[in-house]
């Protein structure tokens, strides 16, 4: 699966929760970051992600013009400098520091399941999903033979009036 | 090459039903979203409904929800509007058309030529 | 519901001018913008994709820009051929169109 453009074809901000409306939060400590599923109290402020979204072209693509197989991967950097991993062998989802171009680790296969809730599937490990266990991130492998639209792997955007990336 | 075929149209008369189909050709028709698209005569477009890659998510217009029904046939590569009920003001020419990414619902990157439906006594 | 509102409704331009046609969304909707193109007769065809990405072989005097609530449309030079109707079309929380623009030749 190789991305078709260096540059993402477009980028907005995000905060981004569980399809049961738990917030994703992230959290510095000991020098590293580390992710939760939590509700937040009312007026707490919910983090924001950047999506980065790029266009990447199936290797099985039959048509050799480019109509068929053409897929939206994403790229989840809540601070500057710092994206969402997939751990396939922890089975994780890790914050780490990279720099461009980013490993294929840090790149998602963008799944549309409802009109306003998405699931994250791994480019490096097809039919594992960003997923959630135990309040917390995981990656959770999903049989064809399911429906994607299993809860725990959904997740929604909401928008932010924010434009800044802290 | 993309082809997108629309069957079904025709003249019928209000509360009858009619089925339209569109056929899908020259792409991996299980991995995108498949939608209608309708356009009365002299007006503008219209969503009026969409499927998911699988079927197992489907969304409805206001207006038509409990009288059309989206389907698709992977097996057969075709997608299916139900029309039950209708109103002269479903006349129009629908239109199929596919997504633009495997998998996500953005975009209408190829439209069939559409069919024309005219609800009238 | 988001609602998509489009100005002006007709534009009347000469060959070879720069038009520019407006998109307006009631809410944010975060570069999940299209905009297609619709000559008398045809079916719509995709022209711009997420905001600003040229659809595959659209020629490069069409271009698209904006965020948030705000999205133009723009042909830098008017062609015969672009004689037709824009619409713009939104996908981030379901799926609306504009009511078009009509681009004429004076």
């Known amino acids: 699966m190789s991305i078709t453009g260096i540059s993402p074809i477009t980028e907005y901000l995000a905060s981004l929760s569980t399809y049961n409306d738990q917030s994703i939060t992230f959290a510095l400590e000991d020098e590293s970051y580390e992710i939760y599923v939590e509700d937040l109290k009312k007026d707490e402020k919910k983090d924001k992600v950047l999506l980065s979204y790029y266009e990447s072209q199936h290797p099985s693509n039959e048509s050799g013009d480019g109509v068929d197989g053409k897929m939206l991967m994403v790229t989840l950097s809540p601070t500057k400098d710092f994206w969402l991993h997939a751990n396939n062998k922890e089975h994780s989802v890790e914050l780490h520091k990279s720099e461009k171009p980013l490993p294929d680790q840090a790149f998602f296969v963008l799944h549309n399941m409802h009109s306003n809730s998405v699931s994250f599937e791994s480019k490096t490990d097809p039919g594992v999903f960003i997923g959630v266990k135990d309040n917390h991130l995981a990656l959770i492998k999903v049989d064809s033979s399911e429906n994607l639209s299993t809860e725990n792997i959904l997740f929604k955007l909401s928008e932010t009036h924010h434009h800044h990336h802290h | 090459e993309v082809q997108l075929v629309e069957t079904g149209g025709g003249l019928v008369q209000p509360g009858r039903s009619l089925k339209l189909s569109c056929v899908a050709s020259?792409?991996?028709?299980?991995?995108?979203?498949m939608y209608w698209i309708r356009q009365a005569p002299g007006m503008g477009l219209e969503w009026v409904s969409s499927?998911?890659?699988?079927?197992?998510?489907?969304y409805y217009l206001d207006s038509v929800k409990g009288r059309f029904t989206i389907s698709r046939n992977n097996a057969e590569n075709t997608v299916y509007l139900q029309m039950n009920s209708l109103r002269s003001e479903d006349t129009a020419t629908y239109y199929c058309?596919?997504?633009?990414?495997?998998?996500?619902?953005?975009?209408?990157?190829?439209w069939g030529q559409g069919t024309l439906v005219t609800v009238s006594s | 519901d988001i609602q998509m509102t489009q100005s002006p409704s007709v534009l009347s331009a000469s060959v070879g001018d720069r038009v520019t046609l407006s998109c307006k969304a009631s809410?944010?909707?975060?570069?999940?913008l299209d905009w297609y193109q619709q000559k008398v007769g045809e079916a719509p065809k995709l022209l711009i994709y997420?905001?600003?990405n040229l659809q595959t072989g659209i020629p490069s005097r069409f271009s698209g820009s904006g965020s948030g609530t705000d999205y133009t449309l723009t042909i830098s030079s008017l062609q015969p051929e672009d004689v037709a109707t824009y619409f713009c079309?939104?996908?981030?929380?379901?799926?609306?169109f504009g009511q078009g623009t009509k681009v004429e030749i004076k």
């Open positions: 809410h944010n909707i975060n570069k999940h």
């Open positions: 058309a596919k997504g633009r990414y495997y998998y996500s619902s953005y975009s209408f990157a190829y």
């Open positions: 020259g792409f991996t028709f299980s991995n995108y979203w």
């Open positions: 997420f905001t600003n």
């Open positions: 499927i998911n890659n699988d079927g197992g998510n489907t």
């Open positions: 079309f939104q996908y981030n929380s379901g799926w609306t």
